[in-house]
Interface confidence: medium
Amino acid sequence: LSTCKTIDMELVKRKRIEAIRGQILSKLRLASPPSQGEVPPGPLPEAVLALYNSTRDRVAGESADPEPEPEADYYAKEVTRVLMVDRNNAIYEKTKDISHSIYMFFNTSDIREAVPEPPLLSRAELRLQRLKSSVEQHVELYQKYSNNSWRYLGNRLLTPTDTPEWLSFDVTGVVRQWLNQGDGIQAFRFSAHCSCDSKDNKLHVEINGISPKRRGDLGTIHDMNRPFLLLMATPLERAQHLHSSRHRRALDTNYCFSSTEKNCCVRQLYIDFRKDLGWKWIHEPKGYHANFCLGPCPYIWSLDTQYSKVLALYNQHNPGASASPCCVPQALEPLPIVYYVGRKPKVEQLSNMIVRSCKCS
Amino acid sequence: LSTCKTIDMELVKRKRIEAIRGQILSKLRLASPPSQGEVPPGPLPEAVLALYNSTRDRVAGESADPEPEPEADYYAKEVTRVLMVDRNNAIYEKTKDISHSIYMFFNTSDIREAVPEPPLLSRAELRLQRLKSSVEQHVELYQKYSNNSWRYLGNRLLTPTDTPEWLSFDVTGVVRQWLNQGDGIQAFRFSAHCSCDSKDNKLHVEINGISPKRRGDLGTIHDMNRPFLLLMATPLERAQHLHSSRHRRALDTNYCFSSTEKNCCVRQLYIDFRKDLGWKWIHEPKGYHANFCLGPCPYIWSLDTQYSKVLALYNQHNPGASASPCCVPQALEPLPIVYYVGRKPKVEQLSNMIVRSCKCS
């Protein structure tokens, strides 16, 4: 492979490897690898492996999150599970004869143990294991609200399945809200979608650990598969650094246009179709703020400079641990235009025309 | 601003301006600006301006679409509006006394005039103007299906509003499905969310052009504000080029790992924590496919080379019309890891660790 100069493929790989070294340590806010002296012998505990697999499954089933990454999102997230209050608890008594819904209760003190502060929560998912089913059903999820009302959260069209399958609902906002309140019991309701004219509103979906017991649906295995919250949160000790360390800024128009930033930033550029391009044929708009990205993204050698100060720079200058980080557009917006073809005016939308923010990538 | 060499700010701007020149022409598949000889004098027709404003509103209310851009999405989209079948049409008779829903009928031959081929459709939005309202209501949208059944499409929680506001629903899949069928009348239903235990399932939302007439809700103004489909589609003549011209490839692992591409592509790189980093402290996984981006993204001078062949290169090598395009990650995936802190095993998720595809940006 060659650009202007011949590229030393091995050197690029080495730089990438060393960048990844710094990236991982930096994401974990570690100045050096943790000591291994106290690690117990033997394989990993089953619960830890199960949690790891839950997280890996989530990765496999999702595309990359494309939103500009807030500072806190750059850092690693600790993953924990909070199981639903046991079905034998008296709290479930009133709900057992309701055919259109199943109820899941959670103890917020269990959640608070995993996530001591609401802002630390990065993501919360409600995970339910649906048993095999031959029917299609449209289901809904609700959150228990004050004075016995229910707030709609989302829905899913469940198609027939030959094997049990995990359902996942993003309940980050709900859990963050619970953490902002006092401790207590909170609830979700999983219901059949009730149509205005339909008579049969029975929930035909069976959820492992809630629906009538089946053989083998007991003990630890049953416990692993009963509804739970999968939580991803910034550990408290890491969060304290977030407040004290130099903030990673969004390299957007708000920041860049009002600063004298020398490094990578979005730069202002207005294109006047007539003056800049000598074009009269675009009738609307007369011009637009195209903007562009410019400024260095220094490559940080982590090999012989493993200091907190240097690691903190990764977040801003090389978050992707690139062998040669580059200042490129992050958020782009489309541009609608009006022009004529003969006598016929046309409205067309041009994608990715306006640079709103940049990033080192 | 300076990197290694001093950057000539004016030259960068000039290069960006000239890149935009080529980009716009390329997006419209024009070898040169269209002739203005036949343009009628006077202001733009009102309907064209209204359509332009609808498109601009859509841009303002949305963030940039972050998905990797398919080849067709690079090119300009023609924007058209298809109004709902007039309320005086006998087809509405049966629906007038239903309190929980309002119905909107569309003639697919009107849609086909704007979008002759299903694959040309890029986006279809159902736009409804909601009149001012003092109530909060949870509403749902359905599509008419064969044998008089309705398919759920989506929902919205509508809060009280002092002014009329536009609601927009993405109905791209539905409209593409209609275009795959024979012509005829198709319908949407906009309904109150009916709860399993609630008695009042009346729709309290009023939609302009459907709900009982109000003063000033007549003539052209009424017509502009009655429910419509906003369609974005690749014009037929532009689509024929898509089939014949050199395809823009996704620079992902599927393509890059099996080709000898010299230009920008994702390059294979497996990191073995132990061998490459000398680390034993990460227990799971043992390593991961980090990958990296490498290869030139040639800058294309459009100033003195306005030929179809050159313009076609923009799509692959400089789709963002950058002054210095750069090969960077497009799709990234997180990596969950297991490690110990003292005796305590931790599961953490590291964001944006795996490069799945690259792009010139």
Epitope: - | R112, E117, S146, N147, Q181, D183, G184, Q186
Partner: antibody, heavy 120, light 112 residues
């Protein structure tokens, strides 16, 4: 005047192939969807396949799916039907028909038909 | 069996009014899809008579009219003439079939 003229029919053995053509004139061929419809001896009409104006979308009846391929050359104003793996039940008069508007599935112009006989 | 049902034969005397019916379902006629009527004279190709259920094709005499209600479509010929002796087919797109388009079995109209 709109004209559609089919050709390419004939006698073929089971398992054999034939390619039918339909030459169009008197209208802007590239603006309309076109269909093949067949009629077995003494029987009713049966829709076979459809190709859209630009040739991007194609649809086939279940009875011919995987065996027949419809294509068009808008430069030559010609429609084609490549028929492979022919069976005795494919014996029929094959008509090409033009859509009234775009792809309305309403056939306002028909060819005179071409006879296809599949027999050993 | 055809998805669209037509009587296989009908007859009428010159000057009379005859109505040929075509019964479908909510996935074709009742689904709002465009319904057409075709006339096929002996030994010739079919010809479009009615499109979109009730619109006469150009050059079709106004003795021919079409209507539709629910899952039923009708073709009415008033003032029957000898040259109207032919096979009549209804046709419609069907959303429940992968085939897409369907014709009725055809009605053989004899003018006595």
């Amino acid at each position: 005047e709109v004209q559609l003229v089919e050709s390419g029919g004939g006698l073929v053995q089971p398992g054999g192939s034939l390619r039918l053509s339909c030459a169009a004139s008197g209208f802007t061929f590239s603006n309309y969807g076109v269909h093949w419809v067949r009629q077995a001896p003494g029987k009713g009409l049966e829709w076979v396949s459809h190709i859209s104006a630009a040739g991007i979308s194609r649809y086939y009846a279940d009875a011919v799916k995987g065996r027949f391929t419809m294509s068009r050359d808008n430069g030559k104003n010609t429609l084609y039907l490549q028929m492979n793996g022919l069976k005795s039940e494919d014996t029929a008069v094959y008509y090409c028909a033009k859509d009234r508007i775009r792809s309305s599935y309403e056939y306002d112009s028909w060819g005179q038909g071409t006879q296809v006989t599949v027999s050993s | 069996l055809p998805v669209l049902t037509q009587l296989s034969s009908m007859s009428g005397s010159p000057g009379q009014t005859v109505t040929i019916t075509c019964t479908g379902s909510s996935s074709n006629i009742g689904g709002g899809y465009y319904l057409s009527w075709y006339q096929q004279l002996p030994g010739t190709a079919p010809k479009l008579l009615i499109y979109n259920a009730n619109n006469r094709a150009s050059g079709v005499p106004n003795r021919f009219s079409g209507s539709k209600s629910g899952n039923l479509a009708s073709l009415t010929i008033t003032g029957l003439q000898a040259e109207d002796e032919a096979d009549y087919y209804c046709g419609c797109y069907d959303s429940s079939l992968s085939t897409g388009y369907v014709f009725g079995g055809g009605t053989k109209l004899t003018v006595l």
